[in-house]
Interface confidence: medium
């Protein structure tokens, strides 16, 4: 199988006329050693190919998890999950954007463009980097959490003497605390402007309120539709 | 109004292959999220997942029959088709289609079932 | 797979009583369950998905309850068409598994 051939992520399917959103399976891969992996592809929004690596918008998962799960990933994917920052730093490898969606309680919409997304590997503590950001959604709320390792409730990389997994109920890229906590718990219409370990995005309604619905997706740079 | 029915052979011969029609109205299999399922159930016995297939041709099995069973679609006659073979007589039973929509696989509206005895 | 166990096997109750179904997951699949209702000679029924969202036209008094492996159906007062078989669903991952039924029939 040459490299053109390789079906490596959602892109690779869409330039392979998958052009219906919806759930596909990759195939293993011996030569980048990655696993089969089913992933949730959107083939629509602003010419398609993203692989979607997180998702919230039914609260029937919790996200207040452990390094491991965090690592393999978690949840139903074809509802809220995680992709698994072992699969997530694989897909990155490569020059990669990020595209952050949100809606409010209200159905408005915003969204967040990262020009460059990488996490680093397991040794690295699954460490985020991202580049230019653009999009709608009030002020980069991801932008203090750049450069910053992945924390769970059982392992601490945050830069702070609280432990901000612990406080913010999620894994995440803590800093000391959060600007943004897109792994925060799931908090209902009535519940979901009253705490601060909601899922929150401070840059557009402030911290403490929680959010309907997110999702987390990449594509490569080089994306052409 | 939302309806499912299935059609296909009363009774089939073991070894022979099975082909079972679901038709439904009231919904379209183009529609993001939507898909149609198989259901069996052996008299007096529990319901059995047998396959399913989404808008986007999103294939799924039962892995301990996925050798045996090929399930297709044609969206715009809206009705889906899935076809078993080498049937034994254990695969007596009856089938049911069932509409899964949304995002969490169930199934929320069904048809009525269609008996299926395999006898020689 | 996620095997699916639900008990009792069968349950005899009386009009007006509360009765309580349980299903219990052999892996945790947070709150993906279904609960199914069916009528002999009749297809199975949706009543409750996610858990605990009662299917639109579902009367009130069916309830359900849990989250990871153990889950349950309620019904707060039986009524005559309450006695049927019973089946759990996860609705997690593929492959989709039914737990065995409960059968509720008239003491």
């Known amino acids: 199988q040459t490299s053109a051939d390789a079906i490596y992520d959602c892109s690779s399917l869409y330039q392979k006329n998958y052009r219906i959103s919806g759930v596909y399976r990759l195939p293993s891969n011996d030569f980048l050693g990655s696993p089969e992996l089913e992933v949730f592809c959107d083939m629509e929004t602003k010419g398609g190919g993203w692989t979607v690596i997180q998702r919230r918008k039914s609260g029937l998962v919790s996200f207040y998890r452990d390094w491991k799960q965090y690592k393999q990933g978690f949840g139903s994917i074809r509802g809220d999950f995680w992709l698994g920052n072992e699969h997530i730093h694989r897909l990155s490898r490569q020059p990669t954007r990020l595209r952050v969606e949100m809606e409010d309680w209200e159905g408005t919409v915003r969204y967040a463009e990262y020009s460059h997304f990488v996490l680093s590997n397991e040794l690295n503590s699954y460490r985020l980097f991202l580049g230019n950001y653009s999009g709608n959604a009030g002020n980069d709320a991801l932008y203090y959490h750049n450069n910053t390792a992945f924390s769970t409730k059982d392992k601490d990389n945050d830069n702070c003497l609280d432990k901000c997994a612990q406080l913010r109920k999620g894994g995440y890229w803590y800093n000391c605390c959060t600007d943004s906590n897109l792994n925060g718990v799931y908090y209902r219409l009535g519940e979901h402007d009253k705490h601060l370990d909601g899922i929150t995005w401070y840059g557009w309604h402030g911290a403490n309120y929680s959010l309907k619905r997110v999702e987390m997706k990449i594509r490569p740079e080089d994306f052409k539709p | 109004q939302i309806t499912l029915k299935e059609s296909g052979p009363t009774l089939v011969k073991p070894t022979q292959t099975l082909t079972l029609t679901c038709t439904f109205s009231?919904?379209?299999?183009?529609?993001?999220?939507?898909?149609v399922g198989w259901i069996r159930q052996p008299p007096g016995k529990a319901l059995e997942w047998l396959a399913l297939?989404?808008?986007?041709?999103?294939?799924r099995y039962s892995p301990s029959l996925k050798s045996r069973l090929t399930i297709t679609k044609d969206t715009s006659k809206n009705l889906v088709v899935l076809t078993m073979t080498n049937m034994d007589p254990v695969d007596t039973a009856t089938y049911y289609c069932?509409?899964?929509?949304?995002?969490?696989?169930?199934?929320?509206?069904w048809g009525r079932g269609t008996p299926v005895t395999v006898s020689s | 797979d996620i095997q699916m166990t639900q008990s009792p096997s069968s349950l005899s109750a009386s009009v007006g009583d509360r009765v309580t179904i349980t299903c219990r997951a052999s892996?945790?699949?947070?709150?993906?369950l279904a609960w199914y209702q069916q009528k002999p000679g009749k297809a199975p029924k949706l009543l409750i998905y996610a858990a605990s969202s009662l299917q639109s036209g579902v009367p009130s008094r069916f309830s359900g309850s849990g989250s990871g492996t153990d889950f349950t159906l309620t019904i707060s007062s039986l009524q005559p068409e309450d006695f049927a078989t019973y089946y759990c669903q996860q609705s997690f991952s593929t492959p989709l598994t039914f737990g065995g039924g409960t059968k509720l029939e008239i003491k």
């Open positions: 892996q945790g699949i947070s709150s993906y």
């Open positions: 009231g919904f379209s299999l183009s529609t993001s999220g939507v898909g």
């Open positions: 297939i989404y808008w986007n041709d999103d294939k």
């Open positions: 069932a509409r899964d929509y949304g995002d969490y696989w169930f199934f929320d509206l």
